[in-house]
Interface confidence: low
């Protein structure tokens, strides 16, 4: 959480970012908000991005002006306009690539003043998991896969019965690298594993941390996924 | 080839007893998980009980649970179903499968009837 | 328990039609979901795993979609050998459940 405040002659809003996470090849945002000003044409909003010359968006007299945006951003954002009179100053990114991450500013200019602050976006790539009986296993065991994950995370396994023990010994993980070349599938297999248990799959890299639980007994199978963006605010 | 051919199947009382088999053959049976699925004549098929490789996982149907017990001889490849307590809802068509990304193979259908 | 409910329940064809059979979870099963064919008189064959796997041998004919809650079966051009009933199944959790069936007859 990031508060800025601006100062325009005695006049300055309370401007407030999120550091956030974008997941590659899908659509992100980059949260921003100030104090509201009913006065939508008297709203300024611009973007800006560190190392960057020219604007990520811009969004003026109630409207986008996108006459000084950068190209790498052309086509792949958005305002949420209906929402900015209320104080709401995020910007949708489209599509989002791991070169998007890095420092951005969001500056504000309303007829109260003036402001800006700071947000660190990283992205990455993250997914859910999901744990299976491996019924094609020689002896019994948990197959945990997780379709997208960059940079390469670590997985460890836990035991609600078996608190504390170190299941490296008995588990096998595996990284593939998807056909685009950036992102991996993780697979994790867990072996000699016992009924009458949960066991928790957890994988995490500096963006994301997922978990899936899978609570085996004589009778049933129940399964629970978990997804905690790291350091967001 | 890969076969599986059920067998046990017959006449029986209600509150008796009876053992379905299964044979396999043309595969590693010790290597794949094991389902009984049944069919009552005309309607649809139910989900009966399941059976991981080396039986460290069983799972039943609430309707059959505490009367039938699945079980495997991975030494004879062959799986069991021991039902007790038959009722008459228990007629039906019984069929084994195997287990692996879906039901892959399945038996011929052995028939079970639970009649006074 | 996961209920699984099929429609149509029966369906009336004629052969070279393209056909599309429904099935809805009550919840969520993600891809874990199987197509079957079942002839009188015999076990089911499987034809589609994991919502959208064609099964070893079955025909292209045959199509899998779906994710979720909601999916689909499609025979793109109907052949006499296919007329049969044809049931979904459920594998993300137990009990394992079938879909009631769809019944295809001939027009």
């Known amino acids: 959480l990031i508060i800025g405040f601006g100062i325009s002659g005695k006049h300055f809003i309370t401007v407030t970012t999120f550091t956030s996470a974008g997941n590659i090849g899908e659509d992100g945002t980059l949260s921003c908000t100030f104090e509201p000003d009913i006065k939508l044409n008297g709203i300024v909003i611009q973007w800006l991005k560190e190392g960057i010359k020219g604007l990520v968006h811009e969004f003026k007299e109630g409207k986008d002006d996108l006459s000084q945006q950068h190209e790498m951003f052309r086509g792949r954002t958005a305002v949420f306009a209906d929402q900015v009179v209320v104080g709401n100053a995020s910007l949708r990114l489209k599509n989002v690539q791991l070169t998007d991450a890095g420092t951005y500013t969001c500056y504000i200019r309303t007829s109260k003043g003036k402001g800006n602050a700071n947000l660190e976006y990283k992205t990455g790539a993250f997914s859910m998991p999901e744990i299976n009986v491996d019924y094609n296993a020689s002896s019994e065991s948990l197959r945990c896969e997780a379709p997208r994950w960059f940079p390469q995370p670590t997985v460890a396994w836990a035991s609600q019965v078996d608190q504390g023990a170190n299941f490296s010994e008995v588990s096998n993980t595996s990284f593939e690298l998807n056909s685009e070349n950036v992102t991996m599938k993780v697979v994790s297999v867990l072996y000699n594993v016992t009924i009458n248990n949960t066991y928790s799959c957890m994988i995490e890299n500096d963006i994301a941390k997922a978990t899936g639980d899978i609570k085996v007994t004589d009778s049933e199978v129940k399964r629970r996924s978990q997804l905690q963006l790291l350091n967001s605010g | 080839e890969v076969q599986l051919l059920e067998s046990g199947g017959g006449l029986v009382q209600p509150g008796g007893s009876l053992r379905l088999s299964c044979a396999a053959s043309?595969?590693?049976?010790?290597?794949?998980?094991m389902h009984w699925v049944r069919q009552a004549p005309g309607k649809g098929l139910e989900w009966v009980a399941s059976i991981s490789s080396s039986s460290g996982y069983i799972y039943y149907a609430d309707s059959v649970k505490g009367r039938f017990t699945i079980s495997r001889d991975n030494s004879k490849n062959t799986l069991y179903l021991q039902m007790n307590s038959l009722r008459a809802e228990d007629t039906a068509v019984y069929y084994c499968a195997r287990a692996s990304s879906g039901m892959d193979v399945w038996g011929q259908g052995t028939t079970v009837t639970v009649s006074s | 328990d996961i209920q699984m409910t099929q429609s149509p329940s029966s369906l009336s064809a004629s052969v070279g039609d393209r056909v599309t059979i429904t099935c809805r979870a009550s919840q969520t099963i993600r891809s874990y979901l199987n197509w079957y064919q079942q002839k009188p008189g015999k076990a089911p064959k499987l034809l589609i795993y994991a919502a959208s796997h064609l099964q070893s041998g079955v025909p292209s004919r045959f199509s899998g979609s779906g994710s979720g809650t909601d999916f689909t079966l499609t025979i793109s051009s109907l052949q006499p050998e296919d007329f049969a009933t044809y049931y979904c199944?459920?594998?993300?959790?137990?009990?394992?459940?079938f879909g009631q069936g769809t019944k295809l007859e001939i027009k």
């Open positions: 199944q459920q594998s993300y959790t137990t009990p394992y459940t």
């Open positions: 043309g595969f590693t049976f010790s290597s794949y998980g």
